[in-house]
Structures are given as C-alpha cells and as structure tokens.
C-alpha cells in the first residue's frame, strides 16, 4: 500500500520465507524459488531503452526495510512492492511504473536518441 510515493515495508516473519525469483535468483535458489529471513519483492523499472523490466526475488531482513520503501529516484522510473504474508506471495504483486513527469516528456526523446 503506497501513500505519498512510499510503500510501507511489511513485518518480517519468525521463520524462513520462500519467494518466486525472476532475473534476481541467488546461487542458493532452486527452481526459481529463493529463501529469505526478510521479504519477497516484485519490482518494475525501465531499462536503458525505456522498456519496462519486471524483477522478483528475495530481500534479506538486513536493509530491506529501506529497500521496500519505494522512494522516488530522480530520472529513474521504478516501483517496488514487498510482502511476507505467505510463501511466494510476490507472485501476486503487480507494481506499476510511476507516471512520466512533464520534464521526462521533454527530456525523454533527447536521452533516448
């Protein structure tokens, strides 16, 4: 749930959590499932050519509170959502890219030439 451009990080669990991983699978993952003491996440961001790329995986408890806060980054369109309520909960996360700012419409074509 986002308010004012931020998403609140969910509460961590007292047991290991399994998450779906895609484009972000650590070495210890098996069959696109990773495990964590923190959160599952799904993230959407623009690649260098402006195409949306969806990534999902595990975030360790250490530092994930910050990572799960969807703090806007200048000149970078991305959105992340985190969950812990059940295993592979990130299968049901569907973050959307934040809308283009007016500046981006002006700058966009120049950057992508």
């Amino acid at each position: 749930k986002k308010e004012d451009g931020e998403s609140t990080a969910p509460t961590p669990r007292p047991k290991i959590l399994r998450c779906k991983c895609h484009h972000h699978c650590p070495e210890d993952s098996v069959n696109n499932i990773c495990s964590t003491d923190g959160y599952c996440f799904t993230m959407i961001e623009e690649d260098d050519s402006g195409m949306p790329v969806v990534t999902s995986g595990c975030l360790g408890l250490e530092g994930s509170d910050f990572q799960c806060r969807d703090t806007p980054i200048p000149h970078q369109r991305r959105s992340i959502e985190c969950c812990t309520e059940r295993n592979e909960c990130n299968k049901d996360l569907h973050p959307t890219l934040p809308p283009l700012k007016n500046r981006d419409f002006v700058d966009g074509p120049i950057h992508h030439k």
Epitope: P14, K15, I16, R18, P26, E27, D28, S29, V30, I33, C34, S35, T36, D37, G38, C58, G60, L61, E62, R86, N87, E88
Partner: antibody, heavy 116, light 112 residues
Framework: QVQLQQPGAELVKPGASVKLSCKAS????????MQWVKQRPGQGLEWIGE????????LYNQKFKGKATLTVDTSSSTAYMQLSSLTSEDSAVYYC?????????WGLGTTLTVSS | DVVMTQTPLSLPVSLGDQASIFCRSS???????????LHWYLQKPGQSPKLLIY???NRFSGVPDRFSGSGSGTDFTLKISRVEAEDLGVYFC?????????FGSGTKLEIK
C-alpha cells in the same frame, strides 16, 4: 514446552501406503515449518521435505517426490506424511522436526517396518 | 546436492579430554542473506537428535558452554572442551542453506 508426538511403530505390507502423524504442542503450530527426516541404520539422516502449516506450502527433496506427501491439520496441530507404494527400502525411522531457520526440536520418531 | 563430509567417523576419548569434530561442505554455506545455516546435533542411542549449535556458533538453550562451534564458508568445527559421560553419542552436522537440506554421516564419540 515444545513437544512433537509420533506413534512408536507402524507395520505395513509391501505395496501399501501409510500415513504417519506428528502432533505438535507447546508452540503456535503455524509459526514454524514442519520437516520430515528419514533415518536408516548405517545410512545417516535424509531430508524428505517440509510444509508450512500457515499456507500448506510444501518443498520436497526430489528423491522423495512421488513417494511422500506432506499435509497438515491446523485444527489439531498435526502434521502428516503419507508414504506410498512401500518397499523394504522404506523401512526406517521417520522423524518430524520443527523448523524456523534450523531444526530446533525433533519428534521421537516412528519406526516403519515394511514386511509381508 | 550439498555433500557434508564429517571427520572422524569415530572419536575415542577419555573423560575430561577435549574433542574436535570437523565438517566440510561441498559448496559454500553462506546464504544469500549473509547467514550461514550450519548446525550441529547430538543423537544418543535410541533417541532423536538434539540441537547443540545453530548457525555455526550459537549455543542452543540449555546446551553447556563446553560445546562451541566455529568455521565459515565450507569448513566447520565442533569442539567439546571437557568431555563428560553424557556427551557420548553420534554428532551430526547439517546445512539448511541449500535445498535439499543435507546432513553429515555422523561422528561417534566413544570412551577410549
């Protein structure tokens, strides 16, 4: 205190199936995974798989897929493992064990004997 | 699967001696979260295993301080500073970093 109660022994015929039980007490059942481990004399310990009682999510050792099926009944805080198409190779002690990030408590084990 | 190699298979000791048991994994047990999920258990005859040490070096509640664990990556050690009669049994190392979770073959601690 944490307790995992298992029947002491089961005797079944080859080709049959058996459903082993593990009744948990002394903690919130849905707050931990339940694992199952096989021990045969001289063969060490083998991890069969695990189930999260909060959402019935299971993970299996590839070696036991098709052999073992893990389920839970949260109303009675009981975990079950069904073993099918039994052969003498399935004769062993089977332990249930509580798992958070590591196994901290084990059941006393059920000795399964497969014999005609 | 990760292979856990335990040495020695048998360890004859005198009561009061120090004992060391070694465990080597076929790949690193450092999890992507930074934790190392390597644990030690003691199984006495006719009993189920009991947790001694979790995550390399943390003593489980009620475990005497004569037990200590150390190591990193792929090489781990369990030390018993002064062996007592109640310590006799089979010691297993176990990893829960990689699925399927695996165990060492065991080290039997016995009286010399």
């Amino acid at each position: 205190q944490v307790q995992l109660q298992q029947p002491g022994a089961e005797l079944v015929k080859p080709g049959a199936s058996v459903k082993l039980s593990c009744k948990a007490s002394g903690y919130t059942f849905t707050s931990y995974w339940m694992q199952w481990v096989k021990q045969r004399p001289g063969q060490g310990l083998e991890w069969i798989g695990e189930i999260d009682p909060s959402d019935n999510y299971t993970l299996y050792n590839q070696k036991f897929k098709g052999k073992a099926t893990l389920t839970v009944d949260t109303s009675s805080s009981t975990a079950y493992m069904q073993l099918s198409s039994l052969t003498s190779e399935d004769s062993a002690v089977y332990y249930c064990a509580r798992f958070g990030y590591y196994v901290d408590y084990w059941g006393l084990g059920t000795t399964l004997t497969v014999s005609s | 699967d990760v292979v856990m190699t335990q040495t020695p298979l048998s360890l004859p000791v005198s009561l009061g001696d120090q004992a060391s048991i070694f465990c080597r994994s076929s790949q690193s047990l450092v999890h992507s979260t930074g934790n190392t999920y390597l644990h030690w258990y003691l199984q006495k005859p006719g009993q189920s295993p009991k947790l001694l040490i979790y995550k390399v070096s943390n003593r489980f509640s009620g475990v005497p301080d004569r037990f200590s664990g150390s190591g990193s990556g792929t090489d781990f050690t369990l030390k018993i500073s002064r062996v007592e009669a109640e310590d006799l049994g089979v010691y297993f190392c176990s990893q829960s970093t990689h699925v399927p979770f695996t165990f060492g073959s065991g080290t039997k601690l016995e009286i010399k």
